[in-house]
Amino acid sequence: FVRTKIDTTENLLNTEVHSSPVQRWSMQVPAEVSAAAGDAAVLPCTFTHPHRHYDGPLTAIWRAGEPYAGPQVFRCAAARGSELCQTALSLHGRFRLLGNPRRNDLSLRVERLALADDRRYFCRVEFAGDVHDRYESRHGVRLHVTAAPRIINISVLPGPAHAFRALCTTEGEPPPALAWSGPALGNGSAAVPSSGQGHGHLVTAELPALNHDGRYTCTAANSLGRSEASVYLFRFHGASAST
């Protein structure tokens, strides 16, 4: 249920010093990992370093958004000689270290994915014993979260000249296509997303004029599924309209 593509290597491996290969700092991460909302995903990250058999204290860190400055989502620390990296930070309790930093593996597990997790993540390791050194991936791994459409709001609002308009907001990835159907609209009348309303994974479509009483249905669809929701318009003639 998790897809990974294109391995990238940052600052690759070894140089020759007196004909003895010495590892340089490098981090290997895939360009992208794809998983469905609700599932778990693994963000792979392995590294090499020049400090042969380092056994001192270390800290493993993952941050989101941008390298070096992005907010930390996970941090753990391992004491000298220990293979256990004790978690000090796990945002919302959903991030867990899958890899073993002592074996040059910082791979991270993200539980119960949400569309908001769709961003780039950067791994970092810090040595703090006799050796003081650190390294962070520069390009990171993009976590691509997919989701079937979910209509999160459908409403009828007052419009100009005692008319009414309808708004339908959905989320999903790929971004869903929205269509309205209802009285005098025909079957599956497409509604163009309102200008500037495609925000992140949210898509909003407006039906600008509801001219007839009855049921109006918003349908959202993408390659992973479809969802629909309805509103009903009933006007009390001779008084102000209501829904």
Epitope: G38, E83, L84, R96, L98, N100, R109, E111, R112
Partner: antibody
Framework: QVQLVQSGGGLVQPGRSLRLSCAAS????????MHWVRQAPGKGLEWVSG????????GYADSVKGRFTISRDNAKNSLYLQMNSLRAEDTALYYC???????????????WGQGTMVTVSS | QSALTQPASVSGSPGQSITLSCTGT?????????VSWYQQHPGTAPKLMIY???NRPSGVSDRFSGSKSGNTASLTISGLQAEDEADYYC???????????FGTGTKVTVL
């Protein structure tokens, strides 16, 4: 209090079917993975199957793959194990168990049912 | 996959410390820090004592502690008490499918 109450065990002939149920209470059922673990008489524990919080991910032991089906109904706070083509070697005490995490595969089992005996014999 | 290896029995006197071992491979215990320990008294369901190598669930006595070195995980019971007499099983995540493997079990006897 937090508990898992099991039902559905019994004596069944080889080749027949049986369905085990596990009713959960005292915790938010749809936040956690759930599992079935069995223990043959006088033997150790064997993981049978696990299911993630939303049924999006499911796993089985090789010994039951293709014959057993795990499922859950989050609206009813219930876990099920449909056992088909039963064999004598499936005879065991079957436990349902709550996981610590939403995903089943990196899990540990912190709450256990009382167990239900399944005996496969002609 | 094959079960993790545990000694069949370990015994100790009240007040003593004993250590139970659980030996796996570089595909399970050695590769991941997802080892759990369960205590089972006769005729009762297992009880989680340790998860993720060294974490104790609430309600579990601090006399129980877990650790790991290489491909071997350990459960130490300090200040051994009569009620500690039970079977103990380890479990580990494994990179093979299915992802769980239990140990063969150790019977702890309090002399």
């Amino acid at each position: 209090q937090v508990q898992l109450v099991q039902s559905g065990g019994g004596l069944v002939q080889p080749g027949r079917s049986l369905r085990l149920s596990c009713a959960a209470s005292g915790f938010t059922f749809d936040d956690y993975a759930m599992h079935w673990v069995r223990q043959a008489p006088g033997k150790g524990l064997e993981w049978v199957s696990g299911i993630s919080w939303n049924s999006g991910s499911i796993g089985y032991a090789d010994s039951v793959k293709g014959r057993f089906t795990i499922s859950r109904d989050n609206a009813k706070n219930s876990l099920y194990l449909q056992m088909n083509s039963l064999r004598a070697e499936d005879t065991a005490l079957y436990y349902c168990a709550k996981g610590l995490w939403p995903s089943y595969d990196l899990d540990a089992f912190d709450i256990w049912g009382q167990g239900t005996m399944v005996t496969v014999s002609s | 996959q094959s079960a993790l290896t545990q000694p069949a029995s370990v015994s100790g006197s009240p007040g003593q410390s004993i250590t139970l071992s659980c030996t796996g491979t570089s595909s399970d215990v050695g590769a991941y820090n997802f080892v759990s320990w369960y205590q089972q008294h006769p005729g009762t369901a297992p009880k989680l004592m340790i998860y993720e190598v060294s974490n104790r669930p609430s309600g579990v006595s601090d006399r129980f502690s877990g650790s790991k070195s290489g491909n071997t995980a350990s459960l130490t019971i300090s200040g051994l008490q009569a009620e500690d007499e039970a079977d103990y099983y380890c479990s580990s995540y494994t990179s093979t499918i299915p992802p769980f493997v239990f140990g063969t079990g150790t019977k702890v006897t309090v002399l």
